[in-house]
Interface confidence: low
């Protein structure tokens, strides 16, 4: 499974969307975990609602929020107020009993915001939202303000 590299600005929100086969993963909860080392275990950060039909409701653990659109086959994780310590390797997982299937591996990189740099002459202009196989990311363009996706119809 390829690892997707996502970059977010410190102090801003980074949103990750992991897509999956809605039928294959029918009835399964999803989780976002942080991998401890290249081959180490994956430590659960947050998981979707215990009642699968309520998976669309946002579940929060600290500054990390998860919600699952089980019809569209998209689980969305938002890392709010991104800090340098949030950098690292993560996984989107689909839970089946005690087993966890990896949906997507994500390497989160945290960039310093040039706007915080007194010497920065140019304003930082975010790149267009990048998309890739299996996951999507959106950056919020103003600090501490989350850009929300339009609801899935």
């Amino acid at each position: 499974l390829n690892t997707t590299v996502l970059q977010g600005m410190a102090g801003q929100s980074l949103r990750v969307s992991c897509t999956y086969d809605a039928l294959k993963h029918w009835g399964r909860r999803k989780a976002w975990c942080r991998q401890l080392g290249e081959e180490g275990p994956c430590q659960r950060v947050v998981s979707t609602h215990g009642v699968w039909l309520l998976a669309f409701l946002k579940k929060r653990n600290g500054s990390t929020v998860i919600a699952d659109d089980t019809l569209a086959g998209t689980v969305t994780i938002t890392l709010k107020n991104l800090q340098a310590g949030d950098a690292g390797l993560y996984q989107c997982q689909s839970l089946r009993g005690r087993e966890a299937e990896v949906l997507q591996k994500v390497l989160v990189e945290v960039l310093e915001d040039p706007l915080d740099d007194q010497d920065a002459g140019d304003l930082w202009v975010p790149e267009e939202s990048s998309s890739f196989e299996g996951a999507q990311v959106e950056h919020s363009t103003s600090r501490n303000q989350e850009t929300s996706f339009p609801p899935t119809s």
Epitope: A22, L23, W26, G27, W52, L53, L54, F56, L57, D69, T70, L71, A72, G73, P151, T152, S153
Partner: antibody
Framework: QVQLVQSGAEVKKPGASVKVSCKAS????????MSWVRQAPGQGLEWMGV????????VYAQKFQGRVTMTRDTSISTAYMELSRLRSEDTAVYYC????????????WGQGTLVTVSS | DIQMTQSPSSLSASVGDRVTITCRAS??????LAWYQQKPGKAPKLLIY???SLQSGVPSRFSGSGSGTDFTLTISSLQPEDFATYYC??????????FGQGTKVEIK
């Protein structure tokens, strides 16, 4: 026992809208997705879309995007399908159908609602 | 969209006959296929899901097989109440779920 009871037959003029209801009983309404399927006279079955009764999230078949709206009222265990800008070719029997979690195939169906579009 | 092609479109058979209906998908749908029976003026009834799983309450003379693109519904010994139209339905790809065009089973 599980029952899906649909509203009665409708006659509409082209360009109008129709809203069909489907009242569920005999099971927990919010525990199953609800789908809608239609069948034109003498023709086959055509899938229209699906709604999650808990969240209200929907997925529509591409053919009906922009014309169909599926909603629900959990307080009365009822799902609704509204089709707008009706044309004569929308004349059909419209079925609601329950989707269990062990498969995405529809296990219980409503009795059907005949919608006739005629000027 | 995925096309589901059923064959034959109609067939005549006698009570006690073994009847086979086939359904071919235009692309791989794994085992996400269901079979329905519909009688005139009635709603369809689920017979088989996941290609080969028999729905509760359905007689064991009905069976399904296949995976990928080719699927079969078999009625081992046709009964009078089995004369109806049968539809296959693929639910592997959303939102382009599609039914086959139907197979009408008539009395010979």
């Amino acid at each position: 026992q599980v029952q899906l009871v649909q509203s009665g037959a409708e006659v509409k003029k082209p360009g109008a809208s129709v809203k069909v209801s489907c009242k569920a009983s005999g099971y927990t309404f919010t525990g199953y997705h609800m789908s809608w399927v239609r069948q034109a006279p003498g023709q086959g079955l055509e899938w229209m879309g699906v709604i999650n009764p808990v969240s209200g999230n929907t997925v529509y078949a591409q053919k009906f995007q922009g014309r169909v709206t599926m909603t629900r009222d959990t307080s009365i265990s009822t799902a609704y399908m509204e089709l707008s800008r009706l044309r004569s070719e929308d004349t059909a029997v419209y079925y609601c159908a329950r989707i269990p979690s062990y498969t995405y195939a529809f296990d219980y169906w409503g009795q059907g609602t005949l919608v006739t579009v005629s000027s | 969209d995925i096309q589901m092609t059923q064959s034959p479109s109609s067939l005549s058979a006698s009570v006690g006959d073994r009847v086979t209906i086939t359904c071919r998908a235009s692309q791989d749908i794994s085992n996400y296929l269901a079979w329905y029976q519909q009688k005139p003026g009635k709603a369809p009834k689920l017979l088989i899901y996941r290609a080969s799983s028999l729905q509760s309450g359905v007689p064991s003379r009905f069976s399904g097989s296949g995976s990928g693109t080719d699927f079969t519904l078999t009625i081992s010994s046709l009964q009078p109440e089995d004369f109806a139209t049968y539809y296959c339905f693929q639910y592997r790809h959303m939102p382009s779920q599609t039914f086959g065009q139907g197979t009408k089973v008539e009395i010979k």
